[in-house]
Each structure stands twice: as C-alpha cells, then as structure tokens.
C-alpha cells in the first residue's frame, strides 16, 4: 500500500473520519481521500451534490449531509452502493423517489427527518436498499399510501414518523414483519381502526402519544402479539374499552397519561395478562371500583397520580398481587385514609405507596391494613393533623416514611408517634410541627416534651350519636341522625356518604346547641332526610363531621328498602289421577326477593315430602309431586316471605283413582238356612258406585237380601239352594269400572251322608 493520502484541505481528520462540517461549503471539496469511511458534510450550504466527487471513495460507509440545502435525495455516484448510513435531516427535500434510492444497495440507516416531505407513496421506497432504520420525523406528511413501505418489508426495524400531519392510518397500513419500533407521536390521528397494525408481527414499541385519538376501535392493536410498550399519552381518550386491547398478549407497559379517561372498565384487561406497568396519570378518574383491575395479576407499577379520585371501593385493588409501586399522588382520597379500611387489600407485594397531596387530614388506624410489606410510604403534601395510634405499626418493613405537615394537633393521642418514628429510624423524612395547642405551635413533634402531649379538650369533633341501621317500606320517608361534640368554636361542616361516596345534593338539616353538662362544649347534629324511598336508596350511610382540626366519621348505618311480597303466579286447584305428576305454580315479587315455601294442610311433614316425591324448581316457580298417591290430596299453601312480611295462597289437590278392591272377594260355601256375607271393599276417587250381579243379571233383591248404604256389603239370610251361583261386584267411577267375583256354593241342611261325613 502506498502512502496515506493527506486530509482534504477544508476538513479535519481523525482516524478514518473526515470532518468537513460547518465550513460554509457550497460544493464538495475536490480532494476527498480514498481512505474515508465516515464523511461529515453537515451544516454547509450544499444545494446539490456532484456524484463525480464520490468516484474514488471505496471505503465510504457513513455520510452526514444534514443541515444543508438539498431539495432531493442525492446520488453519491459509485459510492452509493456501499454507503451504509446516510443522514439527510434538516434539508429542503420535498419528496422521495424510488429511483433516487435504487443505487443504495447497502443502505441500512436513512435519516430524512426535518425536511419538507408531504406524502409517502408506494413508489418511494423500492425493493433493494436493506434499510433497517428510517427516520421521517418532522416533515409535513399528511398522506401515507397503503403499502408505502412494503419495499422495505424484509429489512426495516425502526420507522420514525413523529411530528408529521398524519390524520388517519389505513387499515393494514404497514406490511413490515421485522419492524420493532414505530414512532407516530405528534401527528393528528383521531381514530385507530381495527386491524390498523396487522402486518407488524415483530413490533415491540409503538408510540402514538400527542395525537388527537379519541377512539380505539375493537381490534385496534390486533396482530401486535409481540408488542411490549404502547404509548398513548396526551390524546383524547375517554375510556379504554375491552375490545381495543384485544391481541396485546405480550404488552409490558401501557402509557395512558394525559388523556380524559374517566372510568376503568374491569373487562378488557384480561387481554393484557403480562402488563407490568400501567400509567393513567393526569386523567379524569374519580373512582376506583371493586376489582376494576383484578385481571392484571402481573402488574408491578400502577401510576394514578393527578386524577380526581375521591372514592376507592373496598377490594378495588383485588387481584393485583404483583403490584410493587402504587402512585396516587394529587388525588382526593382523604376519606380512604381517614376512615376506610380494606381499600388496599390484595396488594400483598406492594413496596411503595405515594399519596402526596391528597388533602389527608388524619390517618386512621386501619387505613393501610393489607400493606404489611410496605417499604416506602409518602404522605407528604398533606396537612395531617392526627395519626391514630399504631396506624403504621404493622408495616414491619417500612424504611421510608414521608410526612410534611405543620398542622399537627399535638395532644395525648399523638404522644405515641415521635418515639415510634425514632425507634424505627423513620424520622429523617418526617417534618411534623404542631399547630395546636397554641403553646406548642410551630414546635417539631420530636422536640415537644412528653408531658406536653395532653388532652385538655377535644378540638376534633367526636361522634356522640351514631346513625342507626333501619328498614323502610318503599315510598316511606326516613331519616338518619348523627351528632358530634367539640370544644372548638371552629366552623363545622356536615356531609353524608352513601356507600363511601359523598351525597352531593343531600336533603340535610343541621343544628347546633351548647352541651347541657358543659357550657364550653358545642353539640352539632345533622339529620339526613330520604323522601319516598326507592330501592335506589338502599346502601350504607355515614355522616362526616369536619372542622379545622379534622373529620370524624360515624359508623355506617344500613338502609334496607322493602316491599311486601305480592304474587305473580298463584297455584290453582287441580284434579289428577294417581301415579301421575302434580304441578303447582307459585311466584312472588318483593324486596328483598321473597322466599317461597310450601305446606300441606297447614304442616310441612306430609307424604310427598317424607317420601322424597316432592320437587321444587326455584327457577321455574313450580312445585312438583311425582307418582301421586291418594294421600297427597289436600290443601296446599304457598307462602311468600321476606323481611317486610308474608302472604299465602291455597290450592286444593284432588287425586282421582280407578276403583279397586281393598280385600279380595273370595268364593264361599254355606249350608241352607245359614247367613252369608260378601264384602266388596272398594277404594277409588271419586268413591266408586257398587252394583251386585248374580250370573249376568243385576241381583234381584228379596227381603232376605240386605245391602249396606254404600253397597259394599251384601248379606243374604236363610240361604236357599237357589242362592248358589256366581256373584259379581261391579265398582264404577268416572275413571272406569272394575269387577270382582265370588262363587257361592249352597249345601243341603246339616245332616249325615251315607259315607259318614257331616253335611254343612
């Protein structure tokens, strides 16, 4: 090899890099050395490139032409075929033609950002250049033609289209099976249609933040089964509906901050079983419902800061067993910490909870129950006045506790806190000073002498009359009463909550009077009126009485609204045959839903029940008796009962039975002059009519023949020889006729036969 060529006159060299940047060049330097691998021509005044200037650059791989005045993608002559990276950002390129790129057979990185490109047609990027990274950010692209990037389908890994003017994406807009990163942030997209991103099988990161997306259609992200990170911040989404997340089975991070999301729907998260981080900060959430995130068992980080959350239902975090970080800063969840217990149940792995700036005035004893593993708790930015004894004591792993409040009520109930904090070495991030009593105002709780923590008065309200659980009939007026006492003259405010949510337009009556026993103490009473109650009024009611020193929460009184049962189906009298099935219907409405019970003839122990032939079908409101027997006949009562009362309806079951003999009719032998009785003991319903025959004719009755009133017993006195014959008992009712026979043999009068036997 000959001697190394010198550096170009207008440039500087380092290794195999030639830096001709920022020299005010309007044309290429003429003496570019052949050893150049990286050529920097950025920040010049190049408006066109002479391809001949690149004839003798066999090693050239990187060309920086950014921040010039090029209007088209230049040709680099013979060097085009081996250039790997071409940087053309910040020029004046208005369009890209496929013909301009054909010669770039080795091109892997093409940066066309910050130019004036207005559209991408499917002729722009031909098959050929193995481009892996394409940057089109900061242009004026408004139109993406379907298949615009198909020519790059075998190579493209990263596509940047941020800061353009794209308003819509065609369905299946990208057929780029190797693409891992797609950046569409800062465009004007309003809607993501279903299947928009189908064809991006390898996509891992999708950036859609700072658009104007207000709707994600079902299946919007279908096909992105390898996607890990989805950015949707700074859009106009009002909800995340279940169908839109369909197919995101590998999603790890979902960024939804700075939208207008007002509700978290439980359904839908099941499609994101691997979700690790969910960011919903800066939205319009006002409540977290029970189990609303229960499907996210792998979630590790949940950010909900800067919303308006004022209600966290018990069990809201159920199912989030892997959650380690929960950010609830800048919400309005004071009530959850001041009163509720159980809001954080299910967060077995939580190690960091931040509640900065939530207007929390007091910390209840069980506010953090379920968070025994917590290591970091931030309660800063809250004007905390009191902390109930042992509020943090179960958090054995707590390493950092942030409190910053100059509002502490330094009375006997706070005496436990300084030694506990110091004993657990948690005082480092606690700035806590007294506001009351006046003698301790401004003093750190850590410097106040133990004997100064005294309870000479009760500034914070104390409940003295609790609202009581009650039951009311629909349409009635009811009231809940709640009273509190305080030694402070600080103004008192009253609120009522139903199922932990404040009633905004409550019909309240408030009054105050001086407590009888102690002239210094004021008693405050609030009465909540509920007029003409409906089922919608049912729930748990609680009063919250607040003054400058804090809020006091009453017990929760349950209101049950009842309606007497009324029948929607009543049983009817029925008549059926034995061995068949009896069916009685009975249904009732009421509130609470009435229970249906059956009785027979006033009792619950009846044959069908004893013999397990009785079946109640609750869903069909039907009562069955199978294999009906005559004993089943009677009066059946259906009783519908709830806490408001009970009603009954009766039906008679009549059981029909074909006639039959109870005792078989037997043949008889009598002597002349004796009396014979033939019994035809029949059952059946209706009771059978009995007719006697002798031979084939109806029996002719004489003064010697006697029948009981029901014809069941035939008595023949002073039998004569002519009485002998075949007697038939015929039993008939509406269901049929049954016959029984008896052969009557008449012997001569008693005496001796020739053979010595006795006659009769």
């Amino acid at each position: 090899a000959g001697p190394r060529a010198p550096c170009a006159a207008a440039c500087t060299c380092a290794g195999d890099s030639l830096d001709c940047g920022g020299r005010g060049l309007a044309a290429l330097p003429g003496d570019l050395p052949s050893w150049t691998r990286s050529l920097n021509l950025s920040y010049n005044k190049l408006s066109e490139i002479d391809p001949a200037g690149f004839e003798d650059l066999p090693n050239l791989q990187e060309v920086y032409l950014n921040n010039n005045e090029l209007t088209a993608v230049p040709s680099l002559g013979a060097a085009s075929s081996h250039v790997v990276s071409l940087f053309l950002q910040h020029n004046k390129i208005r369009s890209v033609e496929g013909s301009q790129l054909k010669a770039y057979l080795s091109l892997e990185v093409l940066d066309l950002s910050l130019n004036n490109i207005t559209e991408v047609r499917n002729t722009c990027f031909p098959h050929g250049p193995p481009i892996k990274e394409l940057n089109l950010a900061g242009n004026r692209i408004g139109t993406l033609e379907l298949g615009a990037f198909d020519g790059l389908s075998r190579s493209l890994l990263t596509l940047r289209l941020s800061k353009n003017r794209i308003t819509q994406l065609p369905v299946r807009a990208f057929k780029l099976p190797r693409l891992t990163q797609l950046d569409l942030n800062r465009n004007r997209i309003r809607l993501i249609e279903g299947l928009t991103f189908q064809g991006l099988n390898s996509l891992e990161v999708l950036k859609l933040q700072r658009n104007n997306i207000s709707k994600l259609t079902d299946g919007a992200f279908w096909g992105l089964s390898k996607m890990h990170v989805l950015h949707l911040e700074y859009n106009s989404l009002v909800e995340v509906n279940s169908g839109s997340l369909y197919g995101l089975t590998a999603l790890h991070q979902l960024h939804l901050s700075n939208n207008s999301i007002a509700r978290i729907h439980r359904k839908g998260w099941s499609f994101c079983q691997k979700l690790h981080e969910l960011v919903l900060s800066f939205n319009n959430l006002t409540r977290l419902d029970e189990e609303s995130l229960a499907e996210l068992s792998s979630l590790s980080v949940l950010r909900l800061s800067h919303n308006s959350i004022s209600h966290i239902a018990e069990g809201a975090f159920k199912g989030l067993r892997s959650l380690r970080v929960l950010d609830l800063d800048h919400n309005e969840i004071s009530g959850t910490i001041e009163d509720t217990s159980g809001a954080f149940s299910g967060l077995d792995s939580l190690s960091k909870l931040t509640l900065f700036g939530n207007k929390i005035k007091s910390v209840a004893k069980r506010a953090f129950s379920g968070l025994e593993g917590l290591e970091h708790l931030n309660l800063g930015g809250n004007a905390i006045r009191s902390v109930q004894f042992d509020a943090f004591v179960k958090m054995k792993n707590l390493k950092e506790l942030h409190i910053s409040s100059d509002s502490f009520l330094c009375d006997c109930q706070l005496k436990w806190l300084p030694p506990w904090l110091i004993g657990r070495m948690l005082q480092a991030f606690v700035t806590a000073t007294c506001a009351h009593p006046e003698s301790l105002k401004g003093q750190s709780i850590f410097s106040v002498p133990p004997e100064s923590f005294v309870c000479d008065d009760f500034l914070k309200p104390q409940i003295i009359t609790q609202p009581e659980t009650t039951m009311a009939m629909v349409g009635k007026d009811i009231r809940f009463t709640c009273s509190a006492a305080s030694s402070s003259s600080s103004p008192m405010t009253f609120a009522w909550k139903k199922d932990n949510e404040v009633l905004t337009n409550a019909d309240m009556e408030n009054f105050v009077h001086v407590h009888a026993q102690d002239g210094e103490v004021m008693e405050y009473t609030t009465i909540l009126h509920l007029r003409q109650v409906t089922f919608g009024h049912e729930g748990r009611y609680q009063c919250v009485i607040t003054n400058h020193f804090g809020s006091t929460y009453s017990h929760k009184a349950r209101l049950t609204v009842n309606v007497l049962p009324s029948f929607t189906k009543t049983p009817h009298d029925i008549t059926i045959r034995t061995t068949t099935m009896a069916r009685l219907e009975c249904a009732a409405t009421g509130h609470p839903n009435p229970q249906i019970a059956w009785q027979k003839d006033g009792g619950t122990d009846f044959p069908a029940a004893r013999e397990r032939r009785m079946h109640v079908m609750p869903d069909d409101d039907v009562f069955f008796i199978t294999d009906v027997k005559i004993d089943d006949a009677g009066v059946y009562s259906c009783t519908a009962q709830n806490s408001a009362g009970s009603i009954s309806a009766n039906a008679t079951l009549t059981v029909l039975e074909t006639p039959s003999l109870v005792v078989p009719l037997e043949d008889r032998v009598v002597s002349v002059g004796e009396t014979v009785a033939l019994q035809c003991k029949a059952t059946g319903n209706p009771p059978p009519r009995i007719t006697w025959f002798k031979g084939d004719r109806p029996l002719s009755l004489t003064e010697r023949h006697h029948l009981t009133p029901d014809n069941q017993l035939l008595v023949v006195q002073n039998v004569v020889a002519e009485d002998a014959g075949r007697y038939t008992c015929e039993m008939s009712n509406t269901l049929g006729t049954e016959r029984a026979h008896s052969q009557l043999s008449v012997l001569p009068a008693a005496g001796c036969r020739k053979d010595g036997t006795t006659v009769g």
């Epitope: 030694p419 110091i422 003093q443 410097s447 002498p449 133990p450 004997e451």
Partner: antibody, heavy 117, light 106 residues
Framework: QVQLVQSGAEVKKPGASVKVSCKAS????????LHWVRQAPGQRLEWIGW????????KYNEKFQGRVTLTADKSASTAYMELSSLRSEDTAVYFC??????????WGQGTLVTVSS | DIQMTQSPSSLSASVGNRVTITCRAS??????LSWYQQKPGKVPKLLIY??SIHSGVPSRFSGSGSGTDYSLTISSLQPEDVATYFC?????????FGQGTKVEIK
C-alpha cells in the same frame, strides 16, 4: 455537631445569686427545649427546669420555684439559669442539656457552683 | 413526683459477664425511661432512651421494660464499662433520676 458550652465555675456566699450561661451551637436554638440539671456531691441528679427558646416558655421544679429563673437570648443562642438565695446545699455541678424523647442527649460540660461563707 | 429506685446500688462482675441493672418507677412512665453512664469527673452520657432506643453506643448495651419496671443489660462487660449508671424518667415533670448503680470489674 451539637455543642453546649457553659460558663466557668463560680464561688458564691450564702444568700447571693448565681447566673450560669449555656451557649448552643450546631442546631436551631429556638427549636429545642433546654433543661437544667444539677448534681450535688454524692447525690443523685436533680432536675431544675426547662425553657423553650422559641417562645420563652418555662417550667420549673417546684422545689426551686421562686428561686430559679430561666431565660434565653435568641440572638446569642444562649440560655441562662439564675439561682438566688443561695445556700450551702446548692453547692453542685450545674448542667444544661438538650432533651429528646424524655432523655438528655446532649449535655454542657457542667459549671461548678460553690456556696461557702 | 415519681420516685425512681435502682438496684443494685453497686455490683462487681468479670469481663465478658452479662450484667443487668433494674429500675422501678413509682408509677407508669409509658416507656419514657433513659439510661446514662457517668464516669468520675465526667458528664453523664446517654446510652438508651425511650426504654430501648440506642443513642449511638455499642450494641452490647440494651434496654427493655414497660409500665413501671425497666432494665439495662450489658451483654458482655468490658473494662471501659466501669462507671456509675443512672436511670431517668421523662414522662412527667419534674424529671427524676435513680440514685445510680456503680459497676466495677472483679
């Protein structure tokens, strides 16, 4: 670091008064209570009283009520203990101390006051 | 005033021995009990406060107790531990001290 430096030893006649000073440094003088304690030869430690320099509140042991006065000069970060009507049994080492959770974490080096005719 | 009674008034033990000093208050002091070590001619040094919180002293010193009965334990007596030990209640005014326990090496 927190330091409490007391004035030097004093010898007083019975019936006289003594004023011992305690200069604080290394912390915000007005934010902590300063206590005074004495130790007479062969006797247990005896608490005299406290002062809160922030609002100049004071509390005294009833045993010394009327004879002791605790004061503070915020600008000089210095506390003073003046004991009047001295008697021989007031001979003791007088300490100033800063309290934390009912315990005296920081002590001055002590000032010996001898009452003798 | 709350009376603080320490026992024993003096003790002698071998190096490495476990030593326990007790302190009884005449009424409940809600764990506001401190222990001090004082060597002749020196200022008392806070060892333990609020019953069991260490004040930057060797871990062989430990405190326990509740209500009216408290104790200081030196798990393994060292030669430099020769001193007088005082207890003090900080729950009410006036603050009161025990009469002291003198610890010596056998």
């Amino acid at each position: 670091q927190v330091q409490l430096v007391q004035s030097g030893a004093e010898v007083k006649k019975p019936g006289a008064s003594v004023k011992v000073s305690c200069k604080a440094s290394g912390y915000t003088f007005t934010s902590y209570y300063l206590h005074w304690v004495r130790q007479a030869p062969g006797q247990r430690l005896e608490w005299i009283g406290w002062i809160y320099p922030g609002n100049v509140n004071t509390k005294y042991n009833e045993k010394f009520q009327g004879r002791v006065t605790l004061t503070a000069d915020k600008s000089a970060s210095t506390a003073y203990m003046e004991l009047s009507s001295l008697r021989s049994e007031d001979t003791a080492v007088y300490f100033c101390a800063r309290e934390e959770l009912g315990g005296f974490a920081y002590w001055g080096q002590g000032t010996l006051v001898t009452v003798s005719s | 005033d709350i009376q603080m009674t320490q026992s024993p008034s003096s003790l002698s033990a071998s190096v490495g021995n476990r030593v326990t000093i007790t302190c009884r208050a005449s009424q409940d002091i809600s764990n506001y009990l401190s222990w001090y070590q004082q060597k002749p001619g020196k200022v008392p040094k806070l060892l333990i406060y609020y019953t069991s919180i260490h004040s930057g002293v060797p871990s062989r010193f430990s405190g326990s107790g509740s209500g009216t009965d408290y104790s200081l334990t030196i798990s393994s007596l060292q030669p430099e531990d020769v001193a007088t030990y005082f207890c003090q209640q900080g729950n009410t005014l006036p603050r009161t001290f025990g009469q002291g326990t003198k610890v010596e090496i056998k």
